[in-house]
């Protein structure tokens, strides 16, 4: 029985040209996390395997930095980065847990005035 829950940063906004940390946390389970995959719609961004380290997709390698922890730092944001991001936790023995984050990338002036969860 899968008892765990994924906590995410939920809906976040960030400024065009800036950076954002995508972060999920798995709680309420003793299952072992074997790896975490980060995906945007149908595109793989990165995989962090507990033993084998990081794999970063070539299309993102210049703009994605591993970490902190199992999270992912997305840099040099563009408006095209707006959309859904998924953290997919592969665990043993529970199986797979998926968390969702919605990122909105805003023009600088908009982001500077009252955007929630803004990352400077």
């Amino acid at each position: 029985m899968m008892t765990g829950t994924i906590e995410t940063t939920g809906n976040i906004s960030a400024e065009k040209g800036g950076s954002i940390i995508l972060q999920c946390h798995l709680s309420s389970t003793t299952a072992q996390v074997t790896q975490v995959a980060w995906e945007q719609q149908d595109q793989l961004l990165a995989i962090c395997n507990a033993d084998l380290g990081w794999h970063i997709s070539p299309s993102f390698k210049d703009r994605v930095a591993p970490g902190p922890g199992l999270g992912l730092t997305l840099q040099s944001l563009t408006v095209n980065d707006t959309g859904e991001y998924f953290c997919i936790y592969h665990t043993y023995p529970d199986g797979t847990y998926t968390g969702r984050i919605f990122l909105e990338v805003l023009e600088s002036s908009v982001a500077e005035h009252g955007a929630r969860f803004q990352i400077p």
Partner: antibody, heavy 119, light 107 residues
């Protein structure tokens, strides 16, 4: 130039063990994981497992867990795979292979070590 | 474990032909797929990584495509030196698994 040089062919008896080495050169050994792949009958490839030379962390295919042990010697930039309790099904060519930088695809391979299990 | 199925064990083609080799994953692997070429008596060589990226020095007649469960490796104009076995591999989740291989034969 990156090179992975494996030890020579082995003829071993059923029930025995074999330890294959993979000596590396041309790159910083601790910055890349090292993997081992079995090829039976000249065709099918099977991933045995991988090791992180930096911290000794290992990931095994459950099929080989308990019989295969992956180790490294950082001082000589050499990776090892030991396979125990051998049977005729273990007769195969074994490769060490190194993935790329932040990429799991294996871009450098050793020349292979042939292991024959026969009484 | 994820099963990678290459439906054709053998494919026969002529020099200059276009050939597609397919690989199907038993569950989604996003774009975490590589293609290797193995010539007789040699080690596998990486041709395509992350489903569609050509490895350094690989001729542009070799291409890869696909996402999720269905992947295709294409040789746009087969050359005599392309006689080999071609393997797909998923590295989305351990244990990393390979397809059974497709042997390309030149008529």
């Amino acid at each position: 130039e990156v090179q992975l040089q494996q030890s020579g062919p082995e003829l071993v008896k059923p029930g025995a063990s074999v330890k294959i080495s993979c000596k590396t050169s041309g790159y910083t050994f601790t910055e890349y994981t090292m993997h081992w792949v079995k090829q039976s009958h000249g065709k099918n490839l099977e991933w045995i497992g991988g090791i992180n030379p930096n911290n000794g962390g290992t990931s095994y295919n459950q099929k080989f867990k308990g019989r295969a042990t992956l180790t490294v010697d950082k001082s000589s930039s050499t990776a090892y795979m030991e396979l125990r309790s051998l049977t005729s099904d273990d007769s195969a060519v074994y490769y060490c292979a190194r993935p790329g930088w932040y990429n799991y695809a294996m871009d450098y391979w050793g020349q292979g070590t042939s292991v024959t299990v026969s009484s | 474990d994820i099963v990678m199925t290459q439906s054709h064990k053998f494919m026969s083609t002529s020099v200059g032909d276009r050939v597609n080799i397919t690989c199907k994953a038993s569950q989604g692997v996003s774009t975490a797929v590589a293609w290797y070429q193995q010539k007789p008596g040699q080690s596998p060589k990486l041709l395509i990584y992350s489903a569609s990226y050509r490895y350094t020095g690989v001729p542009d007649r070799f291409t890869g495509s696909g996402s999720g469960t269905d992947f295709t490796f294409t040789i746009s104009s087969v050359q005599a030196e392309d006689l080999a076995v071609y393997h797909c591999q998923q590295h989305y989740i351990t244990p990393w698994t390979f397809g059974g291989g497709t042997k390309l034969e030149i008529k």
